[in-house]
């Protein structure tokens, strides 16, 4: 996240992180319910972790945290690498969560966000657009959800309704390593992080996000069936 | 399957502005998962990366080179170009041009698709 | 800028030998931004392995990549004889840097 700020401790307590090894974050992702995490199709790996209830960027141990493997990632079925449609996945995880004030899903948006919607999207990607910086504790960042025509002009013959653009004002934006974490709307999850300009950060050139409320149905479905 | 081919004059006089094209085809380069770069080889020596741009016209420089290098994009060409400042001899070199892929996670996945290379000599 | 040094600068190998090719950086870098190239005289680079570890498609499993910190390295299992080329490094941490290379001939 660049420009953002030091999160509240546990108020974003659906954020998780995509582990590489022991400790190598590599995306963001968002628990929906006890067993389910959402995160970005191209987040993909054959094996990692998932860290939860994790304040900090260093794998020193905090109370709140849990960890798990996933023993299952489901990639939406329209998501092709390299491209953007449908970047979504869902990971259920080796066991159910613990409820606590630090690990707690977020409810999925039904309806999706209409412009000037005021956001919140997280994560502990790089804070410097063209270099990386890392945060030491998990980054906040408000943004606004932009209309149609303003997220096309910024990336013409890129944007379909399965992404949403928010964000642009210059030097505020999500990042590399924010992939897969939550933009929360009122409260409710609307969407993933899914990309952007490289740089980052750069004028007329908003973050992208997966817009979840084209998704509900399947991923209640394939929750569901799995 | 995609090919960078690079082209522009083999002789450049001290002082003046190197200028090459890198021509996509094969594929387009107007898309959002990849960044477009040049990368030089002085004769007989290592890789040196100079910059890259986004179909969109975003540019990353080389610090070093920074003052004196300007990479642009024509999408309706699907081309990219350099542009080297003030040359010396020290500018003498094969140029390549090459594609990364780029997204959000915190993954580098390489330069996986390169031009065969252009050599420039700067010299009056 | 991150400085890469490769090392042995020339490695004397038989076909069949195992290759093991250093790669040091001045300071820390992420092995998600660490990757290596082959290149044979006359060619363009050619990417062999990304993320210090995964290969790049068409990359036989002879080839692996491993390491974290400072010090990486690429490991030929059995060198075959198109094999003997020069390899570099990449780091792309912060501004991207590239390693002296180290050249892989046959003994």
């Known amino acids: 996240i660049v420009n953002g700020s030091d999160c509240q401790k546990d108020a974003q307590p659906w954020q998780g992180a995509l582990l590489l090894g022991p400790n190598k974050l590599y995306c963001g992702a968002v628990l929906i319910s006890p067993q389910w995490l959402l995160t970005a199709a191209h987040c993909r790996k054959p094996v990692f972790r998932i860290r939860l209830g994790h304040h900090s960027m260093s794998p020193v141990y905090e109370s709140g945290q849990q960890m798990f493997q996933g023993i299952k990632s489901i990639p939406h079925p329209g998501y092709s690498h390299p491209g953007h449609s449908n970047d979504l996945m869902l990971i259920k995880m080796n066991r159910k969560i613990r409820d606590s004030h630090s690990v707690k899903p977020v409810e999925i948006a039904c309806d999706c966000a209409t412009e000037g919607t005021r956001c919140m999207v997280s994560g502990w990607g790089t804070t410097s657009s063209s270099h990386n910086n890392f945060p030491k504790v998990l980054q906040c960042l408000n943004i606004t959800v932009l209309s149609e025509e303003r997220c096309k002009n910024s990336y013409p013959g890129q944007i379909d309704k399965t992404m949403f653009c928010a964000g642009d004002e210059e030097g505020r934006d999500s990042c590399q390593g924010d992939s897969g974490g939550p933009v929360v709307c009122n409260g409710k999850l609307q969407g993933l992080v899914s990309w952007g300009d490289f740089p980052c950060a750069q004028r007329n050139r908003p973050g992208v996000y997966t817009n979840l409320c084209e998704f509900v149905k399947w991923i209640k479905d394939t929750m569901n069936s799995n | 399957q995609l090919q960078l081919q690079e082209s522009g004059p083999g002789l450049v006089k001290p002082s003046e502005t190197l200028s090459l094209t890198c021509t996509v085809s094969?594929?387009?380069?107007?898309?959002?998962?990849?960044?477009w770069g040049w990368i030089r080889q002085p004769p007989g020596k290592g890789l040196e990366w100079i910059g890259s741009i986004s179909y969109s016209g975003s540019t990353y420089y080389n610090p070093s080179l920074k003052s004196r290098v300007t990479i642009s994009v024509d999408t309706s060409k699907n081309q990219f170009s350099l542009k080297l400042s003030s040359v010396t001899a020290a500018d003498t070199a094969v140029y390549y041009c090459?594609?990364?892929?780029?997204?959000?996670?915190?993954?580098?996945?390489?330069?996986?698709?390169w031009g065969q290379g252009t050599t420039v000599t700067v010299s009056s | 800028e991150i400085v890469l040094t490769q090392s042995p600068g020339t490695l004397s190998l038989s076909p069949g030998e195992r290759a093991t090719l250093s790669c040091r950086a001045s300071q820390s870098v992420s092995s998600s931004y660490l990757a290596w190239y082959q290149q044979k005289p006359g060619q363009a680079p050619r990417l062999l392995i990304y993320?210090?570890?995964s290969r790049a498609t068409g990359i036989p499993d002879r080839f692996s990549g491993s390491g974290s910190g400072t010090d990486f390295t690429l490991t030929i299992s059995r060198l075959e004889p198109e094999d003997f080329a020069v390899y570099y490094c990449?780091?792309?941490?912060?501004?991207?840097?590239f390693g002296g290379g180290t050249k892989v001939e046959i003994k």
């Open positions: 094969g594929g387009s380069i107007s898309s959002s998962s990849y960044y």
């Open positions: 993320g210090a570890s």
């Open positions: 090459a594609r990364g892929e780029y997204d959000r996670s915190y993954y580098y996945y390489g330069m996986d698709v």
């Open positions: 990449q780091q792309a941490f912060s501004s991207p840097t």
